[in-house]
């Protein structure tokens, strides 16, 4: 799996999308987990409704929400009030029994809020897009990691 980078601004919301084959993953619940270290386990953050037919209902765990368009094949995770400690490697997963298939590996990067750091110089931050379900503005941009890029910094 390639890793997709999603960048968001601290204090704002970041929306992560994970497309998948709706027929291949029919009837399967989904989850969002955080990778603990390069070879560590993926720790569950939030999962979709325990009734698959209600997967579109937004489920929250703290500031993280998940919702699944099972017909369209898109899992959406919202990280509300993004903080620096939210940065890291995550996975979108499709669950079957005690097993989990990785739908997408995601690297979340948190950018400083330029309003809080006016001397940040040429700090780049993404454009705005209106969220359908919430009145607040979502910031997100994604790219795939280039070959050779490492999602985790080397440990000494």
């Amino acid at each position: 799996h390639n890793t997709t980078v999603f960048q968001g601004v601290a204090g704002q919301s970041l929306q992560v999308s994970c497309p998948y084959d709706s027929m291949k993953h029919w009837g399967r619940r989904k989850a969002w987990c955080r990778q603990l270290g390069e070879k560590g386990p993926c720790q569950r953050v939030v999962s979709t409704h325990n009734l698959w037919l209600l997967s579109f209902l937004r489920r929250w765990n703290g500031s993280t929400a998940i919702t699944d368009d099972t017909l369209g094949g898109t899992l959406t995770i919202t990280l509300r009030n993004l903080q620096p400690h939210d940065a890291g490697l995550y996975q979108c997963q499709s669950l079957h029994g005690s097993e989990a298939d990785t739908l997408r590996k995601v690297l979340v990067e948190v950018l400083a809020d330029p309003l809080d750091h006016r001397d940040a110089g040429d700090l780049w931050f993404p454009g705005e897009s209106e969220s359908f379900e919430d009145a607040h503005v979502e910031h997100s941009i994604s790219r795939s990691l280039l070959e050779g890029e490492i999602p985790f910094p080397p440990t000494s």
């Epitope: 029919w26 009837g27 409704h49 325990n50 009734l51 698959w52 037919l53 209600l54 579109f56 209902l57 937004r58 489920r59 929250w60 368009d69 099972t70 017909l71 369209g72």
Partner: antibody, heavy 126, light 106 residues
């Protein structure tokens, strides 16, 4: 008039089977999730299970106590939802209701049930 | 499973009284809660969905509020035809009902 009518209830011995029917009229049956509930004599309401709209291809969900014994199905051409009950137990004795899930859009619905049938009594006894 | 504790289990009030029923969830259920009315020998009737939305055709004296774990159902002015048992139903995790509140006229 939007209506649901259950049928098929009756007296049955433990371990036997029974099939309930829920005939819908007055609305586009294929567009709605359909659910079954039950109410034991003098008790509260209990969700049994439901089946998704046609878009969800007959996918079903059940409460733990009936999983593996009960099966919900639907026939869009007849606008009928079924509850097939196998290996019946005395604790399955109840009035069984079918109900329609409230629909928001093609994809979204809410498990609020806005149309109910009159109910059919199922008695499991030897 | 999520437990729904409904209170009181029964109440007696006069016509015109304001009646309040509460439903407490054993964990946060957002606003994933509905309220039903059931008259003796009849099927339940949906009154309120998603905690606070009044179902079409339901009189405006019925209302619902709350989010998280604590929810309230109110009849602003009790009418004789409101004699029934009222149930809350959550759908945050599976579907479960409260034990019901039987409303009678004094």
């Amino acid at each position: 008039e939007v209506q649901l009518v259950e049928s098929g209830g009756g007296l049955v011995q433990p371990g036997r089977s029974l099939r309930l029917s829920c005939t819908a009229s007055g609305f586009t049956f294929d567009d709605h999730a359909m659910s079954w509930f039950r109410q034991a004599p003098g008790k509260g309401l209990e969700w049994v299970g439901f089946i998704g709209s046609k878009a969800y291809g007959g996918t079903t969900e059940y409460t733990a106590s009936v999983k593996g014994r009960f099966t919900i199905s639907r026939d869009g051409s007849k606008s009928i939802a079924y509850l097939q009950m196998n290996s019946l137990k005395t604790e399955d004795t109840a009035v069984y209701y079918c109900a329609r899930g409230k629909r928001y859009s093609y994809t979204y619905w809410t498990p609020a049930f806005d149309v109910w049938g009159q109910g059919t009594m199922v008695t499991v006894s030897s | 499973d999520i437990q729904m504790t409904q209170s009181p289990s029964s109440l007696s009030a006069s016509v015109g009284d304001r009646v309040t029923i509460t439903c407490q969830a054993s964990q946060d259920i957002t606003n994933y809660l509905n309220w039903y009315q059931q008259k003796p020998g009849k099927a339940p009737k949906l009154l309120i969905y998603d905690a606070s939305n009044l179902e079409t055709g339901v009189p405006s004296r019925f209302s619902g509020s709350g989010s998280g774990t604590d929810f309230t159902f109110t009849i602003s002015s009790l009418q004789p035809e409101d004699i029934a048992t009222y149930y809350c139903q959550q759908y945050d995790s599976y579907l479960t009902f409260g034990g019901g509140t039987k409303v009678e006229i004094k």
